[in-house]
């Protein structure tokens, strides 16, 4: 769930998610609408799609707690949990490394971005 995601993002990016990413742009944080503002925002939009897919599969994305290992900069999702737990971990791992890959284009002005300014077509999944 959310606790897993926060911890994973902090470990991978080195940034405190609550200060740096939740919210950020038009898709990082709860909800999301409009065209993503930059590559970091695209990471979150893709992550939203990943979660949406798991919701259609009956997974409790905010409640399910999974185990994972973080060592030498890599995330290893445990194969011990249920299908939902493993897939949820995979979604979170993907967004964490996506955010890390795009740290160089991170824009402080997009933190706490005013959502009514999020216009344009919301990308489909």
């Amino acid at each position: 769930g959310i606790l897993n995601l926060n911890k994973m993002v902090k470990q991978v990016t080195g940034k405190m998610p609550i200060l740096s990413y939740w919210p950020y742009g038009c898709h990082c944080g709860l909800g999301g609408r409009g065209q993503p503002k930059d590559a970091t925002d695209w990471c979150c939009q893709t992550h939203d799609c990943c979660y949406d897919h798991l919701k259609t599969q009956g997974c409790s994305i905010y409640k399910d707690y999974y185990r994972y290992n973080f060592s030498q900069g890599n995330i290893h999702c445990s194969d011990k949990g249920s299908w939902c737990e493993q897939q949820l971990c995979a979604c979170d791992k993907e967004v964490a490394f996506c955010l890390k890959r795009n740290l160089d284009t991170y824009q402080k002005r997009l933190r706490f971005y005013w959502r009514p300014h999020c216009r344009g077509q919301t990308p489909g999944c």
Partner: antibody
Framework: QVTLKESGPGILQSSQTLSLTCSFS??????????VAWIRRPSGKGLEWLAH???????RYNPSLKSRLTISKDTSRNQVFLKITSVDTADTATYYC????????????WGTGTTVTVSS | QIVLTQSPAIMSASPGEKVTISCSAS?????MYWYQQKPGSSPKPWIY???NLASGVPARFSGSGSGTSYSLTISSMEAEDAATYYC?????????FGAGTKLELK
Amino acid sequence: QVTLKESGPGILQSSQTLSLTCSFSGFSLSTSGMGVAWIRRPSGKGLEWLAHIYWDDDKRYNPSLKSRLTISKDTSRNQVFLKITSVDTADTATYYCARRGPGTWYFDVWGTGTTVTVSS
Amino acid sequence: QIVLTQSPAIMSASPGEKVTISCSASSSVSYMYWYQQKPGSSPKPWIYRTSNLASGVPARFSGSGSGTSYSLTISSMEAEDAATYYCQQYHSSPLTFGAGTKLELK
């Protein structure tokens, strides 16, 4: 050849603690990905998963029974243990231990089972 | 938790007859697993990941399904197939089993 064998008290009184032992051979619980579970079948009912323990000592419990269950292992002696506190007649069942193969979501080898009767 | 409902609870089939045992999940699952249990014996893995036969399972058995509806089929019933069959999921925690279908020889 992989084998598992359960042992227990046979009969015990209501409110007592049930202690079960699973002795296994043919595999090691120190192998990455390996796990052993306890499953029971009350007389005339279906199977119920109770708990799991893994090579790294990670433990999982059935939420409906979690407060009463404790699973543990002795890797060097190839044994897994289950304790159920405050038993009552509803805990009368055949108890099985089973191996969960690495990376699978099912049990590939089961023990023969041990019958436990709780008397009031 | 996901509840697995097996139907029928008890059934009988004649040798050579086609048999279908159903397992319905209370919400969608990714895979279903099946076990066979005979009186006095422990359960044996029978079908894994919905449609794959476990080692030593005769080819007359098959598994299928998706979402909330899964089934185990015997193309031609034989005496040795008389047993109780259980379905199991671990799509989401906790891991759950169906109550079982007892298949008898007519």
